[in-house]
């Protein structure tokens, strides 16, 4: 007869393992008991449990309510046990022993497996920034048995650094993601993908990257220099940008205070109907946590009566 | 035939110390495990230390621990129990018993006595 | 340490009758119980062991039944030379322990 194992049994940690062992024997070859023992180099043999065929299932003291029988029906040459609910110091070799009439004894070993699923955590980097150099991202660890792999998906263009590190059971993997920070960036997904043999799928972390930039200012409503005349309804200036975070927009004149009936809604200045009080310098002041920028425009209104033609300067400032 | 005849017991005071023998014959003495079971008088079976075949593993009750020392000489097919510090409470016939050697290669459960000497007391007074 | 009580400590019967004696372990024990008669003056002689294979040369009016935790030793015809004292023992764990035994008495 000959024993019939595995050379490894992979369960994932909390799972049952079926330790298999089963003597293929001649007809009339009986099995008399089963021995199994925890067999780590170095370290003496650790009984974990007997199957007699005449007193039954002893588990020892050390694994008292952790190790059974398979459910029935059992075939009586079916030595294999269950290891209830497997912890990681449970990984290791095992050995079983079967005593057998009249053929003897027959030895057999496996290792015992047990993978530790990783819970894999995102950490963002500091604050990105438009115009700052190559900057950390986002960092991702996952510790696991075996150490996991950790990679990113991601659409943004960066460059990826990992380190491991080894403890006693497990080992823990850190990967950093670096980026130039650029606007185009904003809002984009940034996932960290974390594979390994204990989970049915890869896990993922998603974080939304947001770079902070202010772009540069710029004023509308002068462009036709000819509708700024006095009486013309309707007038009015809007303030262009754009930013992360959302800009606040605040308007001022240089060359005094706001004319009376102007009203300001965020970044657009409305004009009641025209008059030459009007003419003036106006500033666009954009401001948001990163930064801020001014651009100012002369307003020039014109009398009709008049033939000299409207002047418009627009100035840019920041 | 299996025999086991145990000798070594008498009276003795208190704190003191006396040494059980038994020798076996009949049997391949070094391939089965030995025990000691003791009766107090008028009393039930108290097992008191069993020791395996090669001398490398013995087992204890904890009312005798640290006092009593199981050993075999297998070359003349003899098992011992010294019995040190005796107590009044130790007062009883002792017995030496051959275990049933059906589990083999697996130390944690011990099996049943299927032989017996004839037992030898041990009166422990002052 | 598990204990083993035995019931009942004592009984009277007559020759021919059908005597049961009961055991039960503190904890599970599979089959790792055996049992014991012994007669005034004399050692212990193993009856049953696996707690219903009968020794070699023990007679077979003499059954052991049960598993777990409850067992149990049927003598189905007491005879004369049955009137003794009977012990339980597991051996499940170290240290092995007695049932504190069963005096069977003549009525």
């Known amino acids: 007869g000959e024993l019939e194992t595995s050379d490894v049994v992979t369960v994932v940690l909390g799972q049952d393992a079926k330790l298999p062992c089963f003597y293929r024997g001649d007809s009339g070859e009986q099995v008399g008991q089963v021995a199994w023992a925890r067999v780590d180099a170095g370290e003496g043999a650790q009984e974990l449990a007997l199957l007699h065929s005449k007193y039954g299932l002893h588990v020892s003291p050390a694994y008292e309510g952790r190790v059974e029988q398979p459910p029935p029906p059992r075939n009586p040459l079916d030595g294999s046990v269950l290891l209830r609910n497997a912890v990681q110091a449970d990984e290791g070799e095992y050995e079983c022993r079967v005593s057998t009439f009249p053929a003897g004894s027959f030895q057999a070993r496996l290792r015992l497996r047990v993978l530790v699923p990783p819970l894999p955590s995102l950490n963002p980097g500091p604050a990105l920034e438009e115009g700052q150099g190559l900057t950390l991202a986002a960092s991702c660890t996952a510790e696991g048995s075996p150490a996991p792999s950790v990679t990113w998906d991601t659409e943004v263009k960066g460059t990826t650094s990992s380190r491991s590190f080894k403890h006693s059971r497990s080992a823990a993997v850190t990967s950093e993601f670096h980026l130039v920070p650029s606007r185009s960036m904003n809002g984009q997904p940034l996932t960290c993908v974390v594979s390994h043999p204990g989970l049915l799928q890869d896990q993922r972390i998603t974080h939304i990257l947001h770079v902070s930039f202010l772009a540069e200012a710029s004023v509308r409503g002068l462009e036709d220099q000819n509708l700024w005349h006095i009486g013309r309804e309707g007038a009015m200036l809007k303030c262009l940008s754009e930013g992360q975070p959302p800009p606040s927009y605040n308007w001022t004149r240089l060359d005094g205070p706001l004319p009376s009936g102007v009203r300001v809604d965020g970044d657009t200045l409305g004009f009641p109907p025209l008059t030459t009080e009007h003419s003036g310098i106006y500033v666009c002041h954009v401001s948001n946590e990163f930064s801020s920028r001014d651009s100012q425009v002369t307003v020039d209104v014109l009398d009709p009566q008049e033939d000299s033609g409207k002047q418009v300067d627009l100035v840019s400032a920041s | 035939e299996v025999q086991l005849v145990e000798s070594g017991g008498g009276l003795v005071q208190p704190g003191g110390s006396l040494r059980l023998s038994c020798a076996a014959s009949?049997?391949?003495?070094?391939?089965?495990?030995m025990s000691w079971v003791r009766q107090a008088p008028g009393k039930g079976l108290e097992w008191v230390s069993s020791?395996?075949?090669?001398?490398?593993?013995?087992h204890y009750a904890d009312s005798v621990k640290g006092r009593f020392t199981i050993s075999r000489d297998n070359s003349k097919n003899t098992l011992y129990l010294q019995m040190n510090s005796l107590r009044a409470e130790d007062t009883a016939v002792y017995y030496c018993?051959?275990?049933?050697?059906?589990?083999?290669?697996?130390?944690?459960?011990?099996?049943?006595?299927?032989?017996w000497g004839q037992g030898t007391l041990v009166t422990v007074s002052s | 340490d598990i204990q083993m009580t035995q019931s009942p400590s004592s009984l009277s019967a007559s020759v021919g009758d059908r005597v049961t004696i009961t055991c039960r372990a503190s904890q599970g024990i599979s089959s790792y119980l055996a049992w014991y008669q012994q007669k005034p003056g004399k050692a212990p002689k193993l009856l049953i062991y696996a707690a219903s294979s009968l020794q070699s040369g023990v007679p077979s009016r003499f059954s052991g039944s049960g598993s777990g935790t409850d067992f149990t030793l049927t003598i189905s015809s007491l005879q004369p030379e049955d009137f003794a004292t009977y012990y339980c023992q597991q051996h499940y764990t170290t240290p092995p322990t007695f049932g504190q035994g069963t005096k069977v008495e003549i009525k």
């Open positions: 009949g049997f391949n003495f070094t391939d089965y495990w």
């Open positions: 018993a051959r275990e049933y050697s059906d589990v083999v290669d697996y130390v944690s459960v011990r099996t049943p006595l299927d032989y």
């Open positions: 020791i395996i075949g090669d001398d490398s593993t013995n």
